[in-house]
Interface confidence: low
């Protein structure tokens, strides 16, 4: 298990939901879909109704304003994306409401959202060298990079 970084000792405060019902596509034009009640996967789909819609909630970060800490929730549910360890699938965890504050082990729910042009990256706050990633014929997981795909396009207004 990768050690938690010092960032895990910080407290993050919820600001607001900044994106509603968006879809994530990787650079192979695979879309994130549900694999089962606990996991996500990526597949080439023909109908965007099949895609998972996400909401993104922003949190304050006193350390580095260039990195926005966000939480990812499946729209119209109480399921949140939670990081595990390297090459482990991200989990969908149920919480009754969006956390007002996040600290310690709960930073598994937070990702630094970075954008470079049309590319979007989600870096685990708990494991700052690991990204949300897709992998051929596998679950959405945490990875450092290739052969997993770590950059995503955000498709908005898909409701």
């Amino acid at each position: 298990s990768a050690p938690f970084s010092f960032l895990s000792n910080m407290t993050y405060h919820f600001i607001r939901i900044i994106k509603h019902e968006f879809i994530l596509n990787d650079t192979l034009n695979q879309t994130i879909i549900r694999a089962n009640d606990q996991y996500l996967t990526a597949a080439a789909i023909h109908n965007l109704d099949e895609a998972v819609k996400f909401d993104m909630g922003a949190y304050t970060s006193s350390k580095d304003d260039t990195k926005v800490p966000v939480i990812l929730r499946i729209s119209k549910t109480q399921l949140y994306v939670s990081a595990q360890d390297e090459d482990q699938p991200v989990l969908l965890k149920e919480m009754p409401e969006i956390p007002k504050t996040i600290t310690g082990s709960e930073t598994n729910f937070l990702f630094f959202w970075e954008t470079h042009g049309t590319k979007n990256y989600f870096i685990s706050v708990a494991h700052p060298n690991l990204f949300i990633a897709t992998k051929h014929d596998n679950w959405v997981c945490l990875a450092k990079g290739l052969p997993s795909i770590t950059d995503f396009q955000i498709l908005e207004n898909q409701a």
Partner: antibody, heavy 122, light 107 residues
């Protein structure tokens, strides 16, 4: 081959509890949630809830909250359903079923156990 | 909870007949509709998911269609082994409710 094998039939008295097991094989147990569904004689299907096999967290349907408990033994890839304070209307076949989301958020149950008959009678 | 209403509750048909079962949801379920087959004394089996997609290994005589609140399950040419009860189930919102079932018999 994916298989879910359930424990045998049970006869219980009103007020008692019953615990049904469901042993999974042929796939990675922790990667798929396990549902419990019941079917009263000659009736339809009623989903009781599910357990997250990775975290152990359970979600119960409103009609069963407070009376049902789902547990796991991950070392043997076995899920359990315990129903307490049994009454005659709990007489039913109880199924475990693996869940899958084939597309988007479309929830389905792709593999089922053979069912366990629970009879509640004084 | 979303209510699922299936019709008819039972039907009798001959081998080779085209058989149709309908399922209506109490609200829009966005094509998140599954069909199961249950033979007497057996567990249900998933046949169709997401309105029209056949689970691998399911014969092509089974099909599904629909949208919004109204969905249809069709057997294009009834076979003796198709005698069973068929259930629809909405896959959109927990507790993922089922229809009451349609019992199919051979004339």
């Amino acid at each position: 081959e994916v298989q879910l094998v359930q424990s045998g039939a049970e006869v219980k008295k009103p007020g008692a509890s019953v615990k049904v097991s469901c042993k999974a094989s042929g796939y990675t147990f922790k990667y798929y949630g396990m549902n419990w569904v019941r079917q009263a004689p000659g009736q339809g299907l009623e989903r009781m809830g599910w357990i997250n096999t990775y975290t152990g967290q359970s979600t119960y349907a409103d009609d069963f909250k407070g009376r049902v408990t789902f547990t796991l033994d991950t070392s043997t890839s076995t899920a359990y359903m315990e129903l307490s304070s049994l009454r005659s209307e709990d007489t039913a076949v109880y199924y475990c079923a693996r869940d899958i989301y084939y597309y988007g958020s479309d929830f389905a149950m792709d593999y089922w156990g053979q069912g366990t008959t629970v009879t509640v009678s004084s | 909870d979303i209510q699922m209403t299936q019709s008819p509750s039972s039907l009798s048909a001959s081998v080779g007949d085209r058989v149709t079962i309908t399922c209506r949801a109490s609200q829009d379920i966005s094509n998140m509709l599954n069909w199961y087959q249950q033979k007497p004394g057996k567990a249900p089996k998933l046949l169709i998911y997401y309105t029209s997609r056949l689970k691998p290994g399911v014969p092509s005589r089974f099909s599904g269609s629909g949208s919004g609140t109204d969905y249809t399950f069709t057997i294009s040419s009834l076979q003796p082994e198709d005698i069973a009860t068929y259930f629809c189930q909405q896959g959109k919102t927990a507790p993922y409710t089922f229809g009451q079932g349609t019992k199919l018999e051979i004339k």
